[in-house]
């Protein structure tokens, strides 16, 4: 039998989604945080 | 300071192969990051084409690109590569890589599919 | 799959002008919603992250907000510099399908 809870808020439950990471830093050393200078 | 820089792109006939590389500098590949691939058609829109998260190896694909595109890594290189198979003409386009989601995105590499 | 719609496609204004960018997610993506500017030639800029996030350096005439499948950049008061296309991507799901852009606005000189 189908016994995943399949729609509690409209979204499976059990399946773990993946976002992508995100890197505020962007160019710069993981520990800087600046802009490219024609802002 | 971070740098991405791809290269292989060119003019190729539709249904040929191509595989693209996107070289890492200012940061180690091997660490776990999510490495990606965008694209974009000449006058047109950003398309997402996939990301590999560089410590598992494990690659993620919208349904659009499964099946003829291919995301892999060396770490030894600190290289990311695209493998391209039976190219269209509407895969031309400009190819990014790009980390993650930041400012980090390589200045492209063109990919001209025509006979 | 997540679609992103983004509107309008382009975007005619002045200098000073208030502008305001819409972006609807196919589903909800609470707020793994991020913003790049493109100009001609170039690799997108990151703007803002998770919705209303600025990046570090980023001016803060720019602003981002929004919920669930509606969001929002707004300059509050356009530059020069500002004229040029902007995306919006969602980052909520590479598993399914889960990180498409939005079409693009074109903002020009009215």
């Known amino acids: 039998s189908y016994s995943m809870e399949h729609f509690r808020w409209g979204k499976p439950v059990g399946k773990k989604r993946r976002p992508v990471k995100v890197y505020p830093n962007g160019a710069e050393d993981e520990s800087a945080e600046a802009f490219p200078l024609e802002f | 300071q971070q740098q991405l820089v791809e290269s292989g792109g060119g003019l190729v006939q539709p249904g040929g192969s191509l595989r693209l590389s996107c070289a890492a500098s200012?940061?180690?590949?091997?660490?776990?990051?999510?490495m990606c691939w965008v694209r974009q058609a000449p006058g047109k829109g950003l398309e997402w084409i996939g990301c590999?998260?560089?410590?598992?190896?494990?690659?993620y694909y919208p349904t659009s690109a499964k099946g003829r595109f291919t995301i892999s890594r060396d770490n030894s290189k600190n290289t990311l590569y695209l493998q391209m198979n039976s190219l269209r003409a509407e895969d031309t386009a400009v190819y990014y890589c790009?980390?993650?989601?930041?400012?980090?995105w390589g200045q492209g590499t063109l990919v001209t599919v025509s006979s | 799959d997540i679609q992103m719609t983004q509107s309008p496609s382009t975007l005619s204004a002045s200098v000073g002008d208030r502008v305001t960018i819409t972006c609807q997610a196919s589903?909800?993506?609470?707020?793994?919603l991020a913003w790049y500017q493109q100009k001609p030639g170039k690799a997108p800029k990151l703007l803002i992250y998770?919705?209303?996030t600025l990046k570090s350096g980023v001016p803060s005439r720019f602003s981002g907000s929004g919920s669930g499948t509606e969001y929002t950049l707004t300059i509050s008061s356009l530059q020069p510099d500002d004229f040029a296309t902007y995306y919006c991507?969602?980052?909520?799901?590479?598993?399914?399908?889960?990180?498409?852009f939005g079409g693009g606005t074109k903002v020009e000189i009215k």
């Open positions: 790009a980390k993650g989601v930041s400012s980090l």
């Open positions: 200012g940061f180690t590949v091997s660490d776990t990051y999510d």
């Open positions: 590999i998260d560089t410590g598992s190896g494990d690659t």
């Open positions: 589903e909800d993506i609470e707020s793994d």
């Open positions: 998770g919705a209303s």
């Open positions: 991507q969602t980052y909520y799901d590479m598993a399914d399908d889960g990180a498409s």
